[in-house]
């Protein structure tokens, strides 16, 4: 399990407890409710991209 206050993830990534791996912060605009997005710098809101036509 991930130790508190540590991060095995590279820059631009954040640990997902749900998926048990590092995930790309770039995916947070598309899936902002993902657990790992809390560990990412504020991501642009989804409306910057036309993800829901």
């Amino acid at each position: 399990e991930q130790a508190p206050g540590t991060s095995p993830c590279s820059s631009g990534s954040s640990w997902s407890a749900d998926l048990d791996k590092c995930m790309d912060c770039a995916s947070c605009p598309a899936r902002p409710h993902s657990d790992f997005c809390l560990g990412c710098a504020a991501a642009p809101p989804a409306h910057f991209r036309l993800l829901w036509p």
């Epitope: 631009g12 998926l19 770039a26 598309a30 409710h33 991501a43 642009p44 910057f48 991209r49 993800l51």
Partner: antibody
Framework: EVKLEESGGGLVQPGGSMKLSCVVS????????MSWVRQSPEKGLEWVAE???????????HYAESVKGKFTVSRDDSKSRLYLQMSSLRPEDTGIYYC??????????WGQGTSVTVSS | DIVLTQSPASLVVSLGQRATISCRAS??????????MHWYQQKPGQPPKLLIK???KLDSGVPARFSGSGSGTDFTLNIHPVEEEDTATYYC?????????FGGGTKMEIK
Amino acid sequence: EVKLEESGGGLVQPGGSMKLSCVVSGLTFSRYWMSWVRQSPEKGLEWVAEIRVKSDNYATTHYAESVKGKFTVSRDDSKSRLYLQMSSLRPEDTGIYYCIGYYADAMDYWGQGTSVTVSS
Amino acid sequence: DIVLTQSPASLVVSLGQRATISCRASQSVSTSSYSYMHWYQQKPGQPPKLLIKYASKLDSGVPARFSGSGSGTDFTLNIHPVEEEDTATYYCQHSWEIPWTFGGGTKMEIK
């Protein structure tokens, strides 16, 4: 190890129907977006359909314009299976159909593909 | 729809040299934070394999001789030094909006 295995392809006459299946293992299937992408020498790689997860907008589906009203994508999270129901098939629907799993954006996991031929 | 134009359509590269493949989008696929362009490698008889995501981030297990760059509408895949196993067709793909689209591919041979 992540594995995606398509089945259901084959030869079908123009106007006919076919249902493709994809079984996924090694992945928390219910959390991943899934797509079908087809490939032919004429059109190259062509995205066909996508289904998102139940927690994101109730498993929203999206389709390429060329297959809207003809193809239906669905998923069964309890069986880790993805489906593509195809109807009113035309010769231009011929190709290799790939099942793909991804969290968002980049298409991480691809199956080996199943071949669909529409011909009389 | 966003059209992705790859160039060249094919190229022959000497072993150990640098290969450069370009992908141009018909509109920007970048925000101030991220670029939504990805690169795939496909070998004969195999499905495409993700190489680079978000323009420059190597997927896990991809050798460091692969690199990606670019933003807005112009993106580049570089391979250096090229190895024999890199013989394949390379595709770009955007995830800016639906429909997701792919480039026409660049077939690379090694001499």
